[in-house]
Interface confidence: medium
């Protein structure tokens, strides 16, 4: 299965769109950052697109998840949100045509069962913190930096793929 | 390769305000925030303040509130800071220093890029 | 205000030397420690971030280590080219602060 062209080009636009939400300058909420963890290494031992694809579905799942709350729709520009949501649904869908035209499904599926849930625990860390911060503005410009980020490696890891191909 | 060029040495009078220009050139000026640096005579580093070039928000140490201004000119991608009712103390070089990651993805406070540093003078 | 000591504030060594340079803070700053070289006339130029994070283009010989109060640099093997003022700084909170800086001059 090859991911279409317009699949990279919505991880770029995906990227746009969270740059464009930033309210706040970080360097104004210095004492709330926090390594959440992200778990580079299961992108980076995945070598084939087969074992890539569920985690990197699962990955934006969660980012979905996360924007998609009551929390965050109050935080963020509802436009921008809106286009946020398209494109990361968009995203799904192309990983989910993949994963239906059976890459993934037979390999070595207790590494990507481990792989998911690194990416999961990932992301009850950094809902933890939202909690834990009461969702101040400083707590969610901390995390759609730190999402911009870890999408980001996430994305370099997509692009790698198609060019070892 | 970003460089970040600051405008030439200044003499100033006590009482009298300097402004020190710095312009970025080779990348993406507006990603980033820039902070400014400065350095007395065979003396330490002192932070003064940042400026994110993307908004403008600004942010100044406790000891230049109210005589330190920073503004930004996107249209040519320099950024200033000027300091105002100099004291014979202030003489320092002045530099202007990049953060090293985009704001976008978070601030890793370390410079990886400076201006070459202009020389304030106060002096009666 | 966070206060960062830079120790010893200055000291003599030999091209092929192992030297270490530590930093302390009046409080901790987690990994938020980053390390510069300046030479006279120069800017300063950044060597290690958070800790331990090697700049690129920066040599290996140089390493950083440490959390929390206090920190090291590491020269594993200096070279003539290393002889300058290096001064760590706390990106934890603002105001940013510097340490005194440390002058590594040739024995």
């Known amino acids: 299965c090859d991911l279409p062209q317009t699949h990279s080009l919505g991880s770029r636009r995906t990227l746009m769109l969270l740059a464009q939400m930033r309210k706040i300058s970080l360097f104004s909420c210095l004492k709330d950052r926090h390594d959440f963890g992200f778990p580079q290494e299961e992108f980076g031992n995945q070598f084939q697109k087969a074992e890539t694809i569920p985690v990197l579905h699962e990955m934006i799942q969660q980012i979905f998840n996360l924007f998609s709350t009551k929390d965050s729709s109050a935080a963020w520009d509802e436009t921008l949100l809106d286009k946020f949501y398209t494109e990361l649904y968009q995203q799904l869908n192309d990983l989910e045509a993949c994963v239906i035209q059976g890459v993934g499904v037979t390999e070595t599926p207790l590494m990507k069962e481990d792989s998911i849930l690194a990416v999961r625990k990932y992301f009850q860390r950094i809902t933890l913190y939202l909690k834990e911060k009461k969702y101040s503005p400083c707590a969610w410009e901390v995390v759609r930096a730190e999402i911009m980020r870890s999408f980001s490696l996430s994305t370099n890891l997509q692009e790698s793929l198609r060019s070892k191909e | 390769q970003v460089q970040l060029v600051q405008s030439g040495a200044e003499v100033k009078k006590p009482g009298a305000s300097v402004k020190v220009s710095c312009k970025a050139s080779?990348?993406?000026?507006?990603?980033?925030?820039i902070s400014w640096v400065r350095q007395a005579p065979g003396q330490g580093l002192e932070w003064m303040g940042w400026?994110?070039?993307?908004?403008?928000?600004?942010g100044y140490a406790q000891k230049f509130q109210g005589r330190v201004t920073m503004t930004r000119d996107t249209s040519t991608s320099t950024v200033y800071m000027e300091l105002s009712s100099l004291r014979s103390e202030d003489t320092a070089v002045y530099y202007c220093?990049?953060?090293?990651?985009?704001?976008?993805?978070?601030?890793?406070?370390?410079?990886?890029?400076w201006g070459q540093g202009t020389l304030v003078t106060v002096s009666s | 205000d966070i206060q960062m000591t830079q120790s010893p504030s200055s000291l003599s060594a030999s091209v092929g030397d192992r030297v270490t340079i530590t930093c302390r803070a009046s409080?901790?700053?987690?990994?938020?420690l980053n390390w510069y070289q300046q030479k006279p006339g120069k800017a300063p130029k950044l060597l290690i971030y958070?800790?331990?994070s090697l700049e690129s283009g920066v040599p290996s010989r140089f390493s950083g280590s440490g959390s929390g109060t206090d920190f090291t640099l590491t020269i594993s093997s200096l070279q003539p080219e290393d002889f300058a003022t290096y001064y760590c700084?706390?990106?934890?909170?603002?105001?940013?602060?510097f340490g005194g800086g440390t002058k590594v001059e040739i024995k």
């Open positions: 220093a990049r953060s090293l990651f985009p704001t976008i993805f978070g601030v890793e406070v370390a410079f990886d890029i």
């Open positions: 080779g990348g993406t000026f507006s990603s980033y925030a």
């Open positions: 400026m994110d070039a993307n908004n403008g928000n600004t």
């Open positions: 409080q901790s700053v987690s990994s938020y």
């Open positions: 958070k800790a331990s």
């Open positions: 700084q706390q990106s934890s909170s603002t105001p940013l602060s």
